[in-house]
Interface confidence: low
């Protein structure tokens, strides 16, 4: 907390500029008008303030806006955002995607902090759903963002937003999350032709039921083993040897290397040995 002291003669700030970096903390407190700071926030980032000086500037804004900063100020916080606590951010009403992008840019390259998590939470709740533009933005900054949402939260993602999802965005999703996302993806991509559809739906197949895998096996999709290994065990078990052979195409030989791992191991145990022998891979049921 900075003591209230009178501003020395001639030091009253007329604008936010480089001269302020030479002000002591108490001088910043006494000589910088909070309203001036709020209107010239965009200049703060161009000035090499110390973290201690930024603390004073934050304190001034907190006094000016005890109920939370307006978006016009938030959008230009820049590095001052790193000084905000989740409690500060919970008071904000952020509605502009440009504001969100500006603040995510400040934190770029860092782990998702509690501050960023709170900011995203406020923004998404304010919008009511994860629309495509928001999802595009969030996954660009945090590829794992989608998989950090609970299945309940994912259920509010509209199918149209699925177009923004890249395969790497789903790398860390667990089966229950894919269970929610898969039907949305199927809906989103339903008008695509066979080969294009498979390219798009492939990353979501960890949530696919048996009947969809059976349908895919009729499409000459040549699923790779990495995708097959991510399928739900309960969805793979009912597939026949012929269906798995059609589903994998030339990749069927890869089953041998994975015979001790789920879901391949469990699937093998469900098959008749005669059927397995038709693959010529030496798989033992």
């Amino acid at each position: 907390e900075v003591e209230k002291t009178a501003c020395p003669s001639g030091k009253k700030a007329r604008e936010i500029d480089e001269s302020l970096i030479f002000y002591k903390k108490w001088e910043l407190e006494a000589c910088v008008d909070a309203a001036l700071l709020a209107t010239q926030m965009d200049r703060v980032n161009a000035i090499p303030f110390t973290y201690e000086q930024l603390d004073v500037l934050k304190h001034k804004l907190d006094e000016l806006y005890p109920q939370g900063y307006p978006e016009s100020v938030i959008q230009h916080l820049g590095y001052l955002f790193l000084k905000m606590s989740p409690e500060d951010i919970r008071k904000w009403n952020v509605t502009s995607l440009e504001t969100l992008k500006a603040l995510l840019e400040v934190n770029k390259g860092h782990e998702m902090s509690p501050q960023v998590a709170t900011l995203i939470d406020r923004f998404v709740k304010g919008r009511g759903q994860l629309d495509k533009d928001t999802l595009d933005t969030l996954t660009a900054f945090y590829p794992g963002y989608l998989c950090s949402l609970s299945p309940e939260e994912l259920s509010s993602v509209p199918p149209s937003s699925i177009w923004a999802v890249r395969p790497q965005d789903l790398d860390t999703c667990d089966p229950r999350q894919l269970d929610v996302l898969y039907p949305k993806a199927r809906l989103a991509f339903q008008n695509m032709n066979g080969s294009e559809y498979f390219v798009k739906i492939q990353s979501f197949l960890g949530g696919a039921p048996t009947e969809d895998l059976k349908a895919l096996s009729q499409q000459n999709v040549s699923m790779d083993l990495a995708t097959f290994m991510k399928l739900r065990t309960d969805a793979v078990l009912p597939l026949t040897v012929a269906e798995v052979q059609k589903l994998l195409g030339p990749h069927v030989e890869g089953l041998k290397a994975e015979e001790r791992h789920r879901p391949v191991r469990d699937w093998i145990l469900r098959q008749r040995q005669d059927d397995l022998d038709t693959l010529g891979l030496g798989l033992q049921g």
Epitope: P86, M112, P114, Y142, G144, Y145, S148, T172, C173, Q177
Partner: nanobody
């Protein structure tokens, strides 16, 4: 429905040990990030330790070297081994589970908590 049930709390003398457990249902402990928080009467909730999906662990400075967080994937349970306990460790300890790689704050799911009391 996700449920987290803590156990293992109790009263202990300073210097003693306790092992807290958090049994999860409807949630796979290896699928996301999990953590332990504590709250003493009249104090704010404090993050004690957390373990990421990749099993990376982090601790509050006040418990480093004394507490160990671990999970047992087979038992689907999170643990907090607390050694060299001090009176200031007295609090209600709650486990929390997050979805995904980010330990978003606050936790997505909370247990009811288990009381730990350390007397001098």
């Amino acid at each position: 429905q996700v449920q987290l049930v803590e156990s293992g709390g109790g009263s202990v003398q300073a210097g003693g040990s306790l092992r807290l457990s958090c049994a999860a249902s409807g949630y796979t402990v290896s699928s996301g990030c999990m953590g332990w928080f504590r709250q003493a009467p009249g104090k704010e909730r404090e993050r004690v330790a957390q373990i990421g999906r990749d099993a990376t662990t982090t601790y509050a400075d006040s418990v480093k070297g004394r507490f160990t967080i671990a999970r047992d994937d087979a038992e689907n349970t999170l643990y907090l081994q607390m050694n060299s306990l001090k009176p200031e460790d007295t609090a209600m300890y709650s486990c929390t589970a997050y979805w995904g790689v980010y330990c978003l704050s606050p936790g997505r799911y909370w247990g009811q908590g288990t009381q730990v009391t350390v007397s001098s």
